[in-house]
């Protein structure tokens, strides 16, 4: 029994930060939850990780690499992440376990979220020579 | 057939740390399902839930051992680890590891338990 | 943290009699019309064996004079007719929240 999970398909950043917002298929507010967020095809780095329950709001915590933050309602965790790179690009996966009460319950794996980091050019404006 | 063997126990002097292992069989400590957890008991008193790890690797952890506690698993060996630093004489218990359901968390099989001592 | 209190803390009986142990939660344990309380026994020695799962499912394997009731914070474990090898500790224990605890448990003696 899996939880749906909707992710936008691609988020283009200009700028150095991002919201990513993972919208589930049950009420955040039943439950003590687990919420993080997951970098790479096979979901090897945990870039973002949240516990929260009813009577709480979580405490997000990073991986070294990443800096984030977040917030939920009763159906959305939204991750925020800042001071990215352009070798952030990469998809990132929404995570959720439901640990208390039982029973057990998390989400079927969504298709991610291509985040892509545009590189910043800085404009030269260059004065042509008179002939 | 489901089994989990406890190892590591013996004594320890205060202020060190120990790493317990609980070897499963019968089951894969990396699917859903089940997870593991890790309870003491101190001589003539009763039990105490330490914390447990779920199939994904997530943790809990019981907020009087929170900063001092840490459950690990390397899944190639199906293990289970028990970390606990900063040891005095009151964690002098039987440390069990024991398999519950994801339905109702009850522990359905335990380990035969390891005595850790913790005295200079 | 629920606090789970047992009574007694030990009683004495004889083999035949039958036996109650109670187990009252500081809140419910109860979600969706499920109770999240367990009932363990443990002998000198010996790790701790599941005997009643979800305030009153039999575990397999588990004698049927062994029964568990209640709902919400009052659950009972009742030994129907007492054999010589239920003489050990009893416990009680909830998984509805973190941390999971357990009752201080209660020793059944021969009388």
């Known amino acids: 029994n899996k939880i749906l999970v909707k992710q936008s398909p691609l988020l283009v950043v200009d700028s150095n930060e991002v919201s990513l917002s993972c919208r589930y298929s049950y009420n955040l507010l039943a439950k003590e939850f687990r919420a993080s967020l997951y970098k790479g095809v096979n979901s090897d780095v945990e870039v973002c990780v949240g516990n929260g329950n009813f009577t709480y709001q979580p405490q997000f915590r990073s991986n070294a690499e990443f800096n984030c933050d977040g917030d939920f309602d009763n159906e959305t965790v939204t991750f925020r992440l800042w001071n990215l790179h352009v070798n952030h690009t990469d998809i990132y996966f929404c995570k959720i376990e439901f640990m208390y009460p039982p029973p057990y319950l998390d989400n079927e794996r969504s298709n991610g979220t291509i985040i892509h980091i545009k590189e910043k050019h800085l404009c030269h404006t260059q004065s042509s020579p008179k002939l | 057939e489901v089994q989990l063997v406890e190892s590591g126990g013996g004594l320890v002097q205060p202020g060190g740390s120990l790493r317990l292992s609980c070897a499963a069989s019968?089951?894969?400590?990396?699917?859903?399902?089940?997870?593991v957890g890790w309870i003491r008991q101190a001589p003539g008193k009763g039990l105490e839930w330490i914390g447990e790890?779920?199939?994904?690797?997530?943790?809990y952890y019981s907020p009087s051992l929170k900063s001092r506690v840490t459950i690990s698993r390397d899944n190639s060996k199906n293990t289970l680890y028990l970390q606990l630093n900063s040891l005095r004489a009151e964690d002098t218990a039987v440390y069990y590891c024991?398999?519950?359901?994801?339905?109702?968390?009850?522990?359905?099989?335990w380990g035969q338990g390891t005595l850790v001592t913790v005295s200079s | 943290d629920i606090q789970l209190t047992q009574s007694p803390s030990s009683l004495s009986a004889s083999v035949g009699d039958r036996v109650t142990i109670t187990c009252r939660a500081s809140?419910?344990?109860?979600?969706?019309?499920?109770?999240?309380l367990h009932w363990y026994q443990q002998k000198p020695g010996k790790a701790p064996k599941l005997l009643i799962y979800?305030?009153?499912s039999l575990q397999s394997g588990v004698p049927s004079r062994f029964s568990g009731s209640g709902s919400g914070t009052d659950f009972t474990l009742t030994i129907s007719s007492l054999q010589p090898e239920d003489f050990a500790t009893y416990y009680c224990q909830q998984s509805y929240r973190s941390p999971r605890t357990f009752g201080q448990g209660t020793k059944v003696e021969i009388k």
């Open positions: 790890i779920y199939h994904s690797g997530s943790t």
């Open positions: 024991a398999r519950y359901g994801y339905y109702y968390y009850d522990f359905d099989y």
């Open positions: 809140q419910s344990v109860d979600f969706h019309g499920i109770s999240f």
């Open positions: 979800a305030a009153s």
């Open positions: 019968g089951f894969s400590l990396s699917t859903g399902g089940v997870g």
